[in-house]
């Protein structure tokens, strides 16, 4: 699987999950989240050659098409597969609230 | 929806489904499919700005990150959303067989 266990410990050039830290204030311009100040969101990056964690029959066909037509703009793309929630603390007036923001952290990627 | 109805009749720059015809022999090197000789597979292409058919909370956050950090390599990607099957005819010996190849035709796209 193209997950954090494999991707963070390798120098994989192809589609893999990459490290990305997002600072809520600096990177998003958000002040409303009290805690955490930022989080390891990660992102997916890398080419999707034939036989590389291809998502569907279509992505397999497109990867094969791309092998035969390397200059073509039609190619599978490396996107999130498994996502995890992020617990946050924010304020409503003076009252702190704890919430889970769903689908916030990328754990693995796929070629779609 | 970023589907064929909208995308094929517009000059949309952002993520949309685009026309692509794949010839089984020429483009894939496949001789095993007897009919059809090729098909309109289509593909997804175009940037994914904030407020553009974003798939998850993560893709929205990443699009916002990208608006503030336009040079970053972390950005949502335009990928298939709705896929349709393709009926084909192939031979087993001298006997023709009809089969549905699932997830072969892109009908709409999303930013993931």
């Amino acid at each position: 699987a193209l997950d954090t266990n494999y991707c963070f410990s390798s120098t994989e050039k192809n589609c893999c999950v990459r490290q990305l830290y997002i600072d809520f204030r600096k990177d998003l311009g958000w002040k409303w989240i009290h805690e955490p100040k930022g989080y390891h969101a990660n992102f997916c990056l890398g080419p999707c050659p034939y036989i590389w964690s291809l998502d569907t029959q279509y992505s397999k066909v497109l990867a094969l098409y791309n092998q035969h037509n390397p200059g073509a703009s039609a190619a599978p793309c490396c996107v999130p597969q498994a996502l995890e929630p992020l617990p946050i603390v924010y304020y409503v007036g003076r009252k702190p609230k704890v919430e889970q923001l769903s689908n916030m952290i990328v754990r693995s990627c796929k070629c779609s | 929806a970023l589907d064929t109805n909208y995308c094929f009749s517009s000059t949309e720059k952002n993520c949309c489904v685009r026309q692509l015809y794949i010839d089984f022999r020429k483009d894939l090197g496949w001789k095993w499919i007897h009919e059809p000789k090729g098909y309109h597979a289509n593909f997804c292409l175009g940037p994914c700005p904030y407020i553009w058919s974003l798939d998850t909370q993560y893709s929205k956050v990443l699009a916002l990150y990208n608006q503030h950090n336009p040079g970053a390599s972390a950005a949502p990607c335009c990928v298939p959303q709705a896929l349709e099957p393709l009926p084909i005819v192939y031979y087993v010996g001298r006997k023709p067989k009809v089969e549905q190849l699932s997830n072969m035709i892109v009908r709409s796209c999303k930013c993931s």
Epitope: G29, K97 | L64, H68
Partner: nanobody, 118 residues
Framework: QLQLVESGGGLVQPGGSLRLSCAGS????????MAWSRQAPGKQRELVAL???????AYVDSVKGRFTISRDNTKKTMSLQMNDLKPEDTAVYYC????????????WGQGTQVTVSS
Amino acid sequence: QLQLVESGGGLVQPGGSLRLSCAGSGIAFSRVTMAWSRQAPGKQRELVALITDGNRSAYVDSVKGRFTISRDNTKKTMSLQMNDLKPEDTAVYYCVATDWVPTRRDYWGQGTQVTVSS
């Protein structure tokens, strides 16, 4: 339930100016990410400009240097100052608010028509 009401649209000559306003009610306005989106005939809605609760703004390339987005959390309003308007800016302009909790949701106003023509 968040409600958004736009105002300030109208007919203007090329090179002219307009100021769009959006008033919000029914939510903690101070935490939402606000944006202006527009839809020209036969086109999808596109992002024009956005502004976060921390006053960070971003613009689509075609309006950079001409449009300015701002917000006032105490008055629960957002505005878009549009200068040097071009015929291609003709569209229905929508106010959009994204609230991120408890689950992400986009709220849209009804829209205000902007027509740039001589």
